[in-house]
Amino acid sequence: SERCDDWGLDTMRQIQVFEDEPARIKCPLFEHFLKYNYSTAHSSGLTLIWYWTRQDRDLEEPINFRLPENRISKEKDVLWFRPTLLNDTGNYTCMLRNTTYCSKVAFPLEVVQKDSCFNSAMRFPVHKMYIEHGIHKITCPNVDGYFPSSVKPSVTWYKGCTEIVDFHNVLPEGMNLSFFIPLVSNNGNYTCVVTYPENGRLFHLTRTVTVKVVGSPKDALPPQIYSPNDRVVYEKEPGEELVIPCKVYFSFIMDSHNEVWWTIDGKKPDDVTVDITINESVSYSSTEDETRTQILSIKKVTPEDLRRNYVCHARNTKGEAEQAAKVKQKGNGCTEPMTL
């Protein structure tokens, strides 16, 4: 047989589907590996072949498309399960070939069990919404292509285990769920159950989105340095340990990169000869505002160390801040002037 371009196991596509629900899985070749689509491939005489390896087995076997009620079928570049079973879990391969060309990729499919409250090992997408913002809508995800537009499915929304009926600021509107002036108490898992008919059978699709209410852009600020500050003087004798915390508050900003760093006499700690240890810790508020603390410590401080300029710096997408620590030698009577 001719050589086949084997793209291996595409672990980026860790597909999870619920047991006893329909699942449509597109062959990843056309989405991520090849420059042309299925229609082009098909019209140039290429055939798409599916096979699989069961969980905990090494043997590749063809997929049985002759099951009762066409439980598993293929339509163009889509593999259909109507519905899935737990033992459908495994690695699936789609191969595009003719007599002169071959390309294939495998991907893992996990069929997941859920309980009556939709608890499962499924990984849910996270939707971040701004606190107090007017209206946020979430849409029941990944239901496109399961039924034609002429079919009007019934949709029921749940928060956790509770059907959303008469929630004061959460309104189900078909495939959409609207949040009015969201608060942190709106955090949680929201599940839509879509029920649609097909060939005299009713199918259910269960989709869950994790809602996380975060700080509003209107409250976004440059970093605020709580410590060091002008009120605290770090007064030490040579030989003592010097510990200076740099504590910085960052308001939540979507996709912001928050940075905190120290400079000693204008240089990064790695570029000075002083034996410095820096430990960092991070904590988050209920709206994902961040407090980042970097503790600078010198085990046995020297008189020279006590004359150095220690500056805490912070940066986010809104701006930068810096604050010098007031360090002096005990009994010296004067604080070294800080030049920023």
Epitope: H168, F180, L183, S185, T287
Partner: antibody
């Protein structure tokens, strides 16, 4: 100094309408969500309605839903409450209040009295 | 909706004494609870938010505690200007709801 000043209260017959205004000064209204809270004579406080800082999201107490409409004009730094189909039980002092999730109702107006009576 | 219940309805205290006011929520409101003071003919004034943080300009004799469903407002040494009605309010869930109030009067 933050100030909220309500106006538009008065005597109105049952079934009638009234529009309350709340003029804000000392801060930019567009940066804050706002609410109306009322207090019937000799009674406690009751939240009536809220509007988000961008004006898109509104919420109402069940007792006024479908009859009252909250709105805002950020360019005029003013909050409004349109009250229709008024009932005797709507008689109260109406306060506008600034709110943030972090600090609740941090500033209140002095209130305007609405009396619904025939 | 979350029902807020305050006790006692009236508290008679002598000036200089300590006053302890209670507020209970019908379900957890985390720390999203505020306390307000209202004097006759005036608007309410924010005293405490986040269950325990004093609002700007509020004297240190006012302190709040609690989380979840049980909350307390303590006035450590009552001054003449502290005799008023005090309301608790939850802002954890819509609709935001108030307690019925506790009147602190001179004994």
């Amino acid at each position: 100094e933050v100030q909220l000043l309500e106006s538009g209260g008065g005597l109105v017959q049952p079934g009638g309408s009234l529009r309350l205004s709340c003029a804000a000064s000392g801060f930019t209204l567009s940066g804050f969500s706002m609410s109306w809270v009322r207090q019937a004579p000799g009674k406690g406080l009751e939240w009536v309605s809220a509007i988000s800082y961008d004006g898109e999201g509104t919420l109402y107490a069940d007792s006024v839903k479908g009859r009252f409409t909250i709105s805002r004009d950020n360019s005029k730094n003013t909050l409004y409450l349109q009250m229709n189909s008024l009932r005797a039980e709507d008689t109260a002092v109406y306060y506008c209040a600034r709110f943030r999730y972090y600090t609740a109702f941090d500033y209140w107006g002095q209130g305007t009295l609405v009396t619904v009576s025939s | 909706e979350i029902v807020m219940t305050q006790s006692p309805a009236t508290l008679s205290v002598s000036p200089g004494e300590r006053a302890t006011l209670s507020c209970r929520a019908s379900q957890s409101v985390s720390s999203n609870l505020a306390w307000y003071q209202q004097k006759p003919g005036q608007a309410p004034r924010l005293l405490i938010y986040g269950a325990s943080t004093r609002a700007t300009g509020i004297p240190a004799r006012f302190s709040g505690s609690g989380s979840g469903t049980e909350f307390t407002l303590t006035i450590s040494s009552l001054q003449s200007e502290d005799f008023a009605v005090y309301y608790c309010q939850q802002y954890n869930n819509w609709p935001w709801t108030f307690g019925q109030g506790t009147k602190v009067e001179i004994k």
